[in-house]
């Protein structure tokens, strides 16, 4: 009796079970009662990442430098190329099809997490006792200067954007 279902890594065609092509190979011809499935390796810059019956391999992804992309991991006959972004840029999506410049944290905000090739800068407001007076993708909030440790006194209070201003203590006459 002809089969109605096939084993894993097989497919049903013309009332018989044929072996799927292994990752890295494409289908040339279906099996017969006399021959096995005929498969051929994918060409240069092509891949197939599953057991398959595809007659064409997929093209490796192109990491377009004009979009700020570069190759993170070169593709093989079984895997696609993985793109990432140039230094200072990050992917706009999980597929990493284009890049945008890392965001800078404005004065009053510090970097909580530095951006990576796949995630943007995460900023946080500088809490009391900390400040940031620059727009930066790297600088964290800095603590206000401790005037006391320098034997000085606060002459001007700090804010989230400015450091305290220290000055000499008033002399007792």
């Amino acid at each position: 009796e002809p089969p109605t279902a096939c084993r894993e890594k097989q497919y049903l065609i013309n009332s018989q079970c044929c072996s799927l092509c292994q990752p890295g190979q494409k289908l040339v011809s279906d099996c017969t009662e006399f021959t096995e499935t005929e498969c051929l390796p994918c060409g240069e810059s092509e891949f197939l990442d599953t057991w398959n019956r595809e007659t064409h391999c997929h093209q490796h992804k192109y990491c377009d430098p004009n979009l700020g992309l570069r190759v993170q991991q070169k593709g093989t006959s079984e895997t696609d190329t993985i793109c990432t972004c140039e230094e200072g840029w990050h992917c706009t999506s999980e597929a990493c099809e284009s890049c945008v410049l890392h965001r800078s944290c404005s004065p009053g905000f510090g970097v909580k997490q530095i951006a990576t090739g796949v995630s943007d800068t995460i900023c946080e407001p500088c809490p009391v006792g900390f400040f940031s007076n620059v727009s930066s993708a790297f600088e964290k909030c800095h603590p206000w200067t401790s005037c006391e440790t320098k034997d000085l006194v606060v002459q001007q209070a700090g804010t989230n954007k400015t450091d305290v201003v220290c000055g000499p203590q008033d002399r007792l006459r």
Epitope: V28, S29, C31, T32, E33, F34, T35, E36, E38
Partner: antibody
Framework: EVKLVESGGGLVKPGASLKLSCAAS????????ISWVRQTSDKRLEWVAS????????YYPDNVKGRFTISRENAKNTLYLQMSSLKSEDTALYYC??????????WGQGTSVTVSS | DIVLTQSPVTLSVTPGDSVSLSCRAS??????LHWYQQKSHESPRLLIK???QSISGIPSRFSGSGSGTDFTLSINSVETEDFGIYFC?????????FGAGTKLELK
Amino acid sequence: EVKLVESGGGLVKPGASLKLSCAASGFTFSNYGISWVRQTSDKRLEWVASISSGGDNTYYPDNVKGRFTISRENAKNTLYLQMSSLKSEDTALYYCARAGEKAMDYWGQGTSVTVSS
Amino acid sequence: DIVLTQSPVTLSVTPGDSVSLSCRASQTINNNLHWYQQKSHESPRLLIKYASQSISGIPSRFSGSGSGTDFTLSINSVETEDFGIYFCQQFSSWPLTFGAGTKLELK
């Protein structure tokens, strides 16, 4: 017991035709593909033709394509090989062989074909 | 076409010897190879399928190995009834092709 019996061989002149038969028994004939394989005097084996279980698909090597025709009558449990435009290089012992799991798992005893002027 | 090259052409052995017969394919055929034995004045018979799978009724001294392009048929302790010609056959693609055979003979 699986049995394949070839017949129809003989001596013919170049350009002539000949029809070989293969009578099958001991298994469900209509469930199996069958092939013809020939063996030359130097003992080399050469695949000649194959036909699917239902008879809807046939396969030939280039050197016999257009000259040989494989066919089957499932109701009669019989396989045929119609050979035409025979050449001296077709001289051989012709076997029919059953295809089981893509292997030629049972062979007949062969029938001899000689093409000579 | 896939060409199968068998070696040696002839192998002269004494019963009790263990032997290895080689079959090399001109291109990769995975494990899509069968072995046949043909004794004098007999039809070929299937010995090993899919390069290494045993066949019911075939003595366990026969074994097959290999994948890709290089295949081996091994006979562990040859018996007198083993003399004859051994053929490999590929079924990876059309046309089906056979090796020219290795003749196993008595030394």
